[in-house]
Interface confidence: low
C-alpha cells in the first residue's frame, strides 16, 4: 500500500495473507468459513512452493494469539483467467479445514448486486504489499482510503486505454494506491467487499494509471457455484 498508514490491529478480521513457503505473496479475503478469495495470477507466482493462508494476523512476523496458518485443500482459479490478461483475475482457495472464527477472524459479506459503485465513493484497501517504490515490505498490515474512479475516465487513452471491462472497477492512484503484494486483497466500500486487487504489473501511485479491481458482484454466480 503506497501512501497509506498502519491499520488498526485486527480491525479487518477478513484479511488474509496468501503465502508461499512461509513468505507473503498476495492478499486475500475470507468470504466463508473455509474459503478465501484472492487473485488468480497469485498462483502463477507460487511456482512449485507450498501455498498456505494466514488468518488473524496483523504482524506477519510477531506471534499473535489469533494468528493461524492454514493449508490449502483446493485452489480454484476462475476458469477463464489467463496469464496474459487481468480479465477474470479471481481465485478461490479452500482451506484444509473451517477457520476458527473469532473477533480477529471473520468472513466479509460480498456484494451480490451487480451495479457499479458510485464514483467518488471512498473505499478501503488493505494489504502487506510494498510501501515504497524502493520495494520496502511492511511487517504490519497497511490500509488506505481511495475514491472510486468512473470507468470512462479510467478507460481514457492516457489511462488504461479501454482495458477496463464492465467486470472491473478503478480507484484513484494519486500517490495513494495498492501495489505489488496487495494483489488479491479486498476493496471494501461501506463494509461490503466490492473489489479484489488485480495482480497485473501496473505502475503504482501514478494518477494516470488508476488501480484496477475485479468486481466481485460480476462473479456472484461463479463464487456461489464453487462455494456450494
Amino acid at each position: 500500500i503506497l501512501g497509506g498508514r498502519e491499520a488498526e490491529a485486527h480491525a479487518r478480521p477478513y484479511m488474509a495473507s496468501v503465502q508461499v513457503n512461509g513468505e507473503h505473496l498476495c492478499g486475500g479475503v475470507l468470504v466463508a468459513e473455509q474459503w478465501v478469495l484472492s487473485a488468480a495470477h497469485c498462483l502463477e507466482d507460487a511456482a512449485d512452493g507450498k501455498v498456505q493462508v494466514l488468518l488473524g494476523a496483523h504482524s506477519l512476523s510477531q506471534p499473535e494469539p489469533s494468528k493461524r496458518l492454514y493449508d490449502v485443500l483446493r485452489a480454484v482459479p476462475h476458469p477463464d483467467s489467463r496469464p496474459d490478461t487481468i480479465d477474470h483475475d479471481l481465485l478461490l482457495l479452500q482451506l484444509s479445514e473451517k477457520a476458527t472464527l473469532g473477533p480477529a477472524v471473520r468472513p466479509l459479506p460480498w456484494q451480490r448486486v451487480d451495479r457499479d459503485v458510485e464514483p467518488g465513493t471512498l473505499c478501503d484497501v488493505a494489504g502487506w504489499g510494498i510501501v515504497s517504490h524502493a520495494g520496502r515490505r511492511p511487517d504490519r498490515l497497511q490500509h488506505v482510503l481511495l475514491p472510486v474512479l468512473d470507468r470512462a475516465t479510467c478507460n481514457r487513452r492516457t489511462h488504461h486505454d479501454g482495458a477496463i471491462t464492465q467486470r472491473m472497477m478503478c480507484a484513484e492512484s494519486n500517490r495513494r494506491d495498492s501495489c505489488k503484494g496487495d494483489s488479491g486483497g479486498p476493496l471494501v466500500c461501506g463494509g461490503v467487499l466490492e473489489g479484489v486487487v488485480t495482480s497485473g504489473s501496473r505502475v503504482c501511485g501514478n494518477r494516470k494509471k488508476p488501480g484496477i479491481y475485479t468486481r466481485v458482484a460480476s462473479y456472484a454466480a461463479w463464487i456461489d457455484s464453487v462455494l456450494a
Epitope: D48, V51, L73, P77, P79
Partner: antibody
Framework: EVKLVESGGGLVQPGGSLKLSCATS????????MAWVRQAPGKGPEWVAF????????YYVDIVMGRFTISRENAKNTLYLEMSSLRSEDTAMYYC?????????????WGQGTSVTVSS | DIQMNQSPSSLSASLGDTITITCHAS??????LSWYQQKPGNIPELLIY???NLHTGVPSRFSGNRSGTSFTLTISSLQPEDIGTYFC?????????FGAGTKLELR
C-alpha cells in the same frame, strides 16, 4: 483427445522398489492436478496419491505415506509414482488419472493402467 | 477418513427398467461426490461429478441427486451397455474415498 499411458509396472519382491510413469497428451498438463488410483483384483478403486498442477500440494493415503512419492515434470507432460518398501498388499493395477480442472477432486480421465505384482 | 456406504452391493434389473444406487457419506461432503462406471475388464470411467453434473458424452438417462449426505445415481431405461460395476467417490477431503461398488446385472 485426452490420453494417459502408464508404464513401469511389473513383478517385484517384497521390500523392493518400482517407478511408474504416466505420459499424457491432448490437454494442457500444467493446468491439471493428477492422481494415482489403484485397484486390487476383484476390489474397488483405491485412491493413492494426488499432486496439484503446480506441484505445491501433495496428498497420500495413509498406508503409502513415506513409502510412495508422487511427482510430475510439466515440461515433459509426465506424472510419476516412486514406490519403495513394497508389500504384497500393494499388488494392484495402478491407474494414472487426471483430476477435474482446478482441484475439483474427481478423476475425469483414466489411463489403461500398469500392473504391479509384489510377490516372492 | 470419510466413509462412503454404497448400496445395494448388487442389483439385477431388466432392460428398460429404472434403477437407483445410493451412496451415504459418513459426514458432510457438500456436493463433492462423483459416480464412476466400470464395465467388465475395463477401466473406471467418470459418469457424474459434483453430485449431479453429467460428464462429457454421458447419456442423459444417467442422473445424480443429493439430499444432505445421501446421494443417488439413477439410470432410467436400462440399456445392455449399462451392465458393470458402479462406484461413488467423495472429493470433499483427503484421503479421497470410494464406495465398495454396486454390481449391476441383467435379469
Amino acid at each position: 483427445e485426452v490420453k494417459l499411458v502408464e508404464s513401469g509396472g511389473g513383478l517385484v519382491q517384497p521390500g523392493g522398489s518400482l517407478k511408474l510413469s504416466c505420459a499424457t497428451s491432448g490437454f494442457t498438463f500444467s493446468d491439471y492436478g493428477m492422481a494415482w488410483v489403484r485397484q486390487a483384483p476383484g476390489k474397488g478403486p483405491e485412491w493413492v496419491a494426488f499432486i496439484s498442477n503446480l506441484a505445491y500440494s501433495f496428498y497420500y493415503v495413509d498406508i503409502v505415506m513415506g513409502r510412495f512419492t508422487i511427482s510430475r515434470e510439466n515440461a515433459k507432460n509426465t506424472l510419476y509414482l516412486e514406490m519403495s518398501s513394497l508389500r504384497s498388499e500393494d499388488t494392484a493395477m495402478y491407474y494414472c488419472a487426471r483430476v477435474g480442472l482446478y482441484g475439483n477432486f474427481f478423476m475425469d480421465y483414466w489411463g489403461q493402467g500398469t500392473s504391479v505384482t509384489v510377490s516372492s | 477418513d470419510i466413509q462412503m456406504n454404497q448400496s445395494p452391493s448388487s442389483l439385477s434389473a431388466s432392460l428398460g427398467d429404472t434403477i437407483t444406487i445410493t451412496c451415504h457419506a459418513s459426514q458432510n461432503i457438500n456436493v463433492w461426490l462423483s459416480w464412476y462406471q466400470q464395465k467388465p475388464g475395463n477401466i473406471p470411467e467418470l459418469l457424474i461429478y459434483k453430485a449431479s453434473n453429467l460428464h462429457t458424452g454421458v447419456p442423459s438417462r444417467f442422473s445424480g441427486n443429493r439430499s444432505g449426505t445421501s446421494f443417488t445415481l439413477t439410470i432410467s431405461s436400462l440399456q445392455p451397455e449399462d451392465i458393470g460395476t458402479y462406484f461413488c467417490q467423495q472429493g470433499q477431503s483427503y484421503p479421497l474415498t470410494f464406495g465398495a461398488g454396486t454390481k449391476l446385472e441383467l435379469r
